[in-house]
Amino acid sequence: FSPLRRISIKILVHSLFSMLIMCTILTNCIFMTMNNPPDWTKNVEYTFTGIYTFESLVKILARGFCVGEFTFLRDPWNWLDFVVIVFAYLTEFVNLGNVSALRTFRVLRALKTISVIPGLKTIVGALIQSVKKLSDVMILTVFCLSVFALIGLQLFMGNLKHKCFRNSLENNETLESIMNTLESEEDFRKYFYYLEGSKDALLCGFSTDSGQCPEGYTCVKIGRNPDYGYTSFDTFSWAFLALFRLMTQDYWENLYQQTLRAAGKTYMIFFVVVIFLGSFYLINLILAVVAMAYEEQNQ
């Protein structure tokens, strides 16, 4: 080994070197949280970049760059260090127009903490392993969601557009003429029935067990879907999103009530099956796989 490499190895294995890097990263994180940093922090930024460059140079000199088994770029954690340094120099010395997007990558510096703290490194390793093991469960989940999304699409397509429409019109007005002029919230509130405090028109249905309209109103299929058009089963993608919402139980009872009001109470069976299969079974299966992966990593 050359004297330069021997010195680099001595520095790399020294505990003070690890401490210096850890303190630098933590200080850097504190500086990144500043709202309006003073001008002198620019020099501090250069110092941080200098320390990170020095760290990487020491590692490259001690282990080699990329040829060989244990070299710098063969360790995935060093890829992070390399990217941090490259972006630091890119944002500083290369004029790339809108640099603010690239400056976002400075946040990656905080992730360097993981490679420095051994316990954290183990946990992240376990997390990555669990993600690898999750692939099969994820495929099963996406498949199940897709199947139920297709069923939902067939059962409820267009149903959430059913609204209670006013039974009194001007002489020149017809359903279609109104449909063509509906634009503002004011227009909607003029022709449709709204429950007090509701941001969407009252839903209704055409089957006997679905929601009925109050006196003076008739159920029609007009306008957009509830929740600014985001809640529907009109396309596979929207149906998939609705099913994902059921699986994660994200305000699912509202979707349940809306759909049952528009389609009929019989369809509660669909929701029972989805909640049992998707929410109780699949979610717990995912958790079980993650738990197994952590257990394996610990052993």
Epitope: M157, G158, H162, F165, N167, S168, L169, T174, L175, E176, S177, M179, F206, E215, G216, T218, C219, V220, K221, I222
Partner: nanobody, 124 residues
């Protein structure tokens, strides 16, 4: 195919009467907001004559008030327009309009569904 069948038109003397009927020939008509009669005289725009809402309340054009009566038979899915004291200016093609929701089998569709029209001629 959505079909509204109008009948009862013809030639009548001023002061005479006619009864127009509009039947929904298909069970795909689910629920109307209203079913009404419109007319279009030669060279003029189509205008409302009378309409009846699904709850039974009616609405008439000023020219039809007191002379014309609109009614419905829900069992037969038919709407009638009884026209009395007819005048020459009532001469027009009378159209039936179902404004509401139909079922295509796969989905529900709301909109305006017009009949072919029946000709009413008031002449001495």
């Amino acid at each position: 195919e959505v079909q509204l069948v109008e009948s009862g038109g013809g030639v009548v003397q001023p002061g005479g009467s006619l009864r127009l009927s509009c039947a929904a020939s298909h069970r795909q008509f689910i629920r109307d907001v209203f079913t009404g009669w419109y007319r279009q005289a030669p060279g003029k725009q189509r205008e409302l004559v009378a309409r009846i809402y699904n709850e039974g309340n009616t609405q008439y054009a000023d020219s039809a008030k007191g002379r014309f009566t609109i009614s419905r038979d829900n069992a037969k899915k038919t709407v009638y327009l009884q026209m009395n004291s007819l005048r020459p200016e009532d001469t027009a093609l009378y159209y039936c309009l179902f404004s509401g929701t139909i079922s295509t089998g796969r989905e529900y569709r709301s909109g305006d569904y017009w009949g072919q029209g029946t000709l009413v001629t008031v002449s001495s």
